[in-house]
Interface confidence: low
């Protein structure tokens, strides 16, 4: 059974009413929430989905964070640094360093590391362990879904009776944060990428830091930026023919923030698309390239383009645009083949420009075949 | 924006079931819990226990053990509150409250409240 | 008979201050962390008001404060409004159990 009224109860007689906010905070304090957060990582296991666990679990990062406590006391696990909890914390602070995470983490003397998700036509995902998927993933699908952020896409089908989608939806919410931001929420749909939140702010709010969260429209109606200082994330959202694409670059440490792994850990950006949801479209690629557009229809996940949008046009043109034969060329050739749709190209270009400003590293923009999943991976 | 809304008004007679729904809407239903609270007319609040969305766990008060099942379906963001063999001090307006999430259990936004009149 | 005592009424003119004690034991106050107050005008939902003893939900005014000492918990009320006039409850989650004090009203006059 799960005990966490137990750690709640050694806790509270630990602390003796200490916890209640103080000016001068004690070592035996931080001493007594390390023992608390060893007991709830005891019996974590017995306590999924438990309100009081997970309270707990949300009030000791909160007082750690709060009493400048360090988590790497005898009875923790060491970690980088203290991410606050994503809980409503109303206090104000003069000064919200708490609200831009680049400063607070250099703080502790290291250099957080970013990973880069993307979303883009018939849809191809990049993951943010940099693997590369082509889905179908129909309807809605978690793309993100960590204690501070949440992105739903909707993926409709390109063409009547096929099993090619392309996102037309993009739900994104903030949530409540601290002194910096209150919840927000960005939706964009085909034709309509708003510069604001849905409640037609441009910020987090009212709260102190409530700039740590910023929308710049960058090209009206075509591209748009939102920056989440606070988490140190930047997501840039575009509309591109008929068709949505996401983008974001995330710090590790936010991307793992997940509470319940069985349920939130299973979003897009982090696991991939279930197998079954997985179109193999290298195979496609190889099997154009000999066959040419006129028989490929037997073998398409999808129906094929008009034949007048011959394999040559379609290689010229993502040439064109992509130079370099990575996955994103492969992924404009499919999208050209499967659609016949002209802007899927420049989907794929965008794509890519967008892993050129968020990717942290360099050498990872393109990806190349050999980084293709093995059947029997998510 | 966030809210919870609740069934209409019942009328049960003693020895009946009520079960009374609350929709949720604004919000991730599943990242917070949901407790029910009942206030007779002229008396205070009296909590009579908390559901985990997510997981389905429950926790009842002690004195209603046994007659209240409280439940939740994910796919439409609603909760309900079944109260079986009914008597009439169970005559009240019952409330839905979302449990606000990360270390402080709290009752951030309430339902609109559903009267339940039990008479013979 | 509610687990947390909290007192019938308290009054107070427009501008004054006014505090609501709530008491409880070692157990349901004085060791928890947990202690939310709400506001309840007649005929509507509860609103929260304070959590957490003493932290404010955005919108709520800061005339409002909470503190907590022992096993009593206070809410005050400075520069007393007309539509503070309402019934205010203390609630303490404490190990299974969510308790509610009584219900305090308080008048305007």
């Known amino acids: 059974p799960c005990k966490i009224l137990k750690c709640n109860s050694e806790f509270w007689s630990a602390t003796s009413g200490s916890h209640a906010p103080a000016s001068d905070d004690t070592p035996e304090f931080c001493a007594a929430l390390r023992s608390y957060a060893l007991c709830t990582r005891r019996t974590a296991r017995t306590c999924r989905g438990d309100l009081a666990y997970h309270s707990a679990v949300h009030g000791i990062e909160d007082l750690m964070s709060q009493h400048n406590c360090s988590k790497d006391g005898p009875t923790s696990q060491p970690r980088l640094r203290t991410l606050p909890p994503a809980g409503d914390s109303q206090e104000r602070s003069d000064s919200p360093e708490i609200c831009h995470y680049e400063k607070s983490f250099h703080k502790h003397s290291a250099t957080p590391n970013y990973t880069h998700c993307g979303l883009f036509g018939d849809p191809h995902l990049r993951t943010f362990t940099d693997r590369f998927q082509t889905c179908k993933v129909q309807g809605a699908w978690p793309l993100i879904d960590n204690n501070y952020l949440n992105v739903q896409v909707t993926n409709t089908p390109v063409l009547p009776g096929s099993a090619a989608t392309a996102t037309s939806k993009l739900t994104i919410i903030f949530k409540n944060f601290q002194e910096c931001v209150d919840q927000k929420v960005y939706q964009a749909e085909m034709d309509e990428l708003p510069a604001a939140f849905v409640d037609g702010s441009k910020n987090g709010g009212d709260k102190h830091g409530a700039n740590s969260l910023k929308i710049t429209e960058k090209v009206s109606g075509q591209h748009v930026e939102i920056q989440a200082k606070y988490i140190g994330t930047t997501i840039v959202v575009r509309q591109v023919g008929r068709y949505l694409t996401f983008a974001v670059r995330m710090p590790e440490e936010v991307v793992n923030a997940v509470e319940d792994w069985d349920s939130q850990g299973l979003y897009l950006c982090l696991r991939g698309c279930p197998l079954n949801q997985q179109i193999d479209f290298q195979a496609f690629h190889t099997n154009a390239e000999g066959t040419g557009a006129r028989r490929l229809a037997a073998a398409s996940p999808a129906p094929t383009a008009p034949e007048t949008f011959p394999y040559e046009t379609a290689v010229a043109k993502c040439k064109e645009k992509l130079p370099v034969e990575d996955l994103y060329y492969q992924a404009c050739v499919f999208d050209l083949l499967t659609t016949g749709d002209v802007n899927f190209t420049l989907a794929a270009y965008y794509a890519l420009e967008d892993v050129k400003m968020l990717h942290s590293n360099k050498d990872k923009l393109h990806l190349y075949e050999r980084t293709r999943d093995l059947p029997g991976r998510a | 924006e966030v809210q919870l809304v609740q069934s209409g008004a019942e009328v049960k007679k003693p020895g009946a079931s009520v079960k009374v729904s609350c929709k949720a809407s604004?919000?991730?239903?599943?990242?917070?819990?949901i407790s029910w609270v009942r206030q007779a007319p002229g008396q205070g609040l009296d909590w009579m226990g908390w559901i985990s969305p997510y997981s389905g766990n429950t926790n009842y008060a002690q004195k209603l053990q046994g007659r209240v099942t409280m439940t939740t379906d994910t796919s439409t963001s609603t909760a309900y509150m079944e109260l079986s063999s009914l008597r009439s001090e169970d005559t009240a307006v019952y409330y839905c409250a979302r449990v606000g999430s990360g270390p402080y259990y709290y009752m951030d936004v309430w339902g609109q409240g559903t009267l339940v009149t039990v008479s013979s | 008979q509610s687990a947390l005592t909290q007192p019938r009424s308290v009054s107070g003119s427009p501008g004054q201050s006014v505090t609501i004690s709530c008491t409880g034991t070692?157990?349901?106050?004085?060791?928890?962390?947990?202690v939310s107050w709400y506001q309840q005008h007649p005929g509507k939902a509860p609103k929260l008001m304070l959590y957490?003893?003493?932290k404010r939900p955005s919108g709520v005014p800061d005339r409002f404060s909470g503190s907590k000492s022992g096993n009593t918990a206070s809410l005050t009320i400075s520069g007393l409004q007309a539509e503070d006039e309402a019934d205010y409850y203390c609630v303490s989650y404490a190990g299974t159990d969510t308790l509610f004090g009584g219900g305090t009203k308080v008048t305007v006059l």
């Open positions: 604004g919000y991730t239903f599943t990242s917070h819990g």
């Open positions: 957490d003893v003493t």
């Open positions: 070692s157990s349901s106050v004085g060791d928890s962390i947990y």
